[in-house]
Amino acid sequence: TLNSVLNSNAIKNLPPPLGGAAGHPGSAVSAAPGILYPGGNKYQTIDNYQPYPCAEDEECGTDEYCASPTRGGDAGVQICLACRKRRKRCMRHAMCCPGNYCKNGICVSSDQNHFRGEIEETITESFGNDHSTLDGYSRRTTLSSKMYHTKGQEGSVCLRSSDCASGLCCARHFWSKICKPVLKEGQVCTKHRRKGSHGLEIFQRCYCGEGLSCRIQKDHHQASNSSRLHTCQRHHHHHHHHHH
């Protein structure tokens, strides 16, 4: 039961803070069933849509990526931007809309939508700007550096998934982001159905693990009009390998 009030502040277009709890819920992350705030939730006040600050693609929706809004802009001021459609220019897979990937600088079609989860930690620069957020943060902090030189365990506060130990991702929980286990085959995942819905989650699951993608559960015993449960499932054998 959600007995809380979530107030979405109007100052969402500020640059992301450095460190533990930056950004907002991410594309590679899904809400636990039943815990996604519905649009009409009586406990919630949602402002008119404003750009979300972010530090990496993971913090944006499935149809968004994280970048400076202007080419060559200040890498410290990044927001979630709408994904790029087929045949549009790109620099990495996350820039392309679901069902597409970045090949030779152009978004092209793919028959699988699992690149973002698998490559989220490979490239974090945007438009040629190197924003070593974590390094910059750990140099500035006065907390024990031990926190940042050892990979976060389950429940540790994190900024991005690369802060977490193997098999964990960085996902929102309450008012922080913490390391949680990456989902295994058969575990429930949730696909974001409407744009911006990821901004309402305060509990997130990780993305599906390597070789898995979040798909509708094929259950012949379920009635066709029943709720469509998504689970982590093995990729089809004919999928392409586009990772670099």
Epitope: L2, N7, S8, L18, A21, M147, V157, H173, P181, C206
Partner: antibody
Framework: EVQLVESGGGLVQPGGSLRLSCAAS????????ISWVRQAPGKGLEWVAS???????YYPDSVKGRFTISRDNAKNSLYLQMNSLRAEDTAVYYC???????????WGQGTTVTVSS | EIVLTQSPATLSLSPGERATLSCRAS??????????MNWYQQKPGQAPRLLIY???KQGSGIPARFSGSGSGTDFTLTISSLEPEDFAVYYC?????????FGGGTKVEIK
């Protein structure tokens, strides 16, 4: 060293207002969620409010509409504006943050609020 | 909201003895592969201090004699050998759901 220092407590009449402050040091304040937790005399602990690093705010039903949590990252300060105070709001108010894990892992020493006529 | 019930309310023990404190949740506090149960110690006139988070992980600087176990709805805090400074009140707290809630506490006193 991480430090959280609360202030602003005192005696107030029912229906009155009070503003608590929490001065933080020893960590990059703007990055982390920070909360208020209270403890009535001789009683247990109760979560009062939280504000995330991305500036969303959260409250339980017991204080919703009466209390407002806010933060000033430039001043490394957290605030709790308490209006329409009731006798049952009498407590020690602690600010607490989650720096290394999701629990309340660092606490201030608390400030006492007494609501009485 | 999730209700946490701690037992016993008071535990009378001598230094060197083993203390076992229990916390039962009204519903499971497990999710995302984590048990969202924490334990705090509070001495008179002082702020609470985090001992254990995620059911069994030690907080920063916590002595090895403090350990946590359990999953689902039943959790245990164990102090393997009580030191004089361990006599205090201990609270469990869940972070699975909003609002986060605390148990009523267990007072560990000197026998």
């Amino acid at each position: 060293e991480v430090q959280l220092v609360e202030s602003g407590g005192g005696l107030v009449q029912p229906g009155g207002s009070l503003r608590l402050s929490c001065a933080a040091s020893g960590f990059t304040f703007s990055s982390y969620a920070i909360s208020w937790v209270r403890q009535a005399p001789g009683k247990g602990l109760e979560w009062v409010a939280s504000v995330s690093g991305w500036l969303d705010t959260y409250y339980p039903d017991s204080v919703k509409g009466r209390f407002t949590i806010s933060r000033d990252n430039a001043k490394n300060s957290l605030y709790l504006q308490m209006n329409s105070l009731r006798a049952e709001d009498t407590a020690v108010y602690y600010c607490a943050t989650s720096l290394q894990n999701y629990a309340f892992d660092y606490w201030g020493q608390g400030t006492t609020v007494t609501v009485s006529s | 909201e999730i209700v946490l019930t701690q037992s016993p309310a008071t535990l009378s023990l001598s230094p060197g003895e083993r203390a076992t404190l229990s916390c039962r949740a009204s519903e499971s506090v497990d999710d995302f592969g984590i048990s969202f149960m924490n334990w705090y110690q509070q001495k008179p006139g002082q702020a609470p201090r985090l001992l254990i988070y995620a059911a069994s992980k030690q907080g920063s600087g916590i002595p090895a004699r403090f350990s946590g176990s359990g999953s689902g709805t039943d959790f245990t805090l164990t102090i393997s050998s009580l030191e004089p400074e361990d006599f205090a009140v201990y609270y469990c707290q869940q972070s699975k759901e909003v609002p986060p809630t605390f148990g009523g506490g267990t007072k560990v006193e000197i026998k």
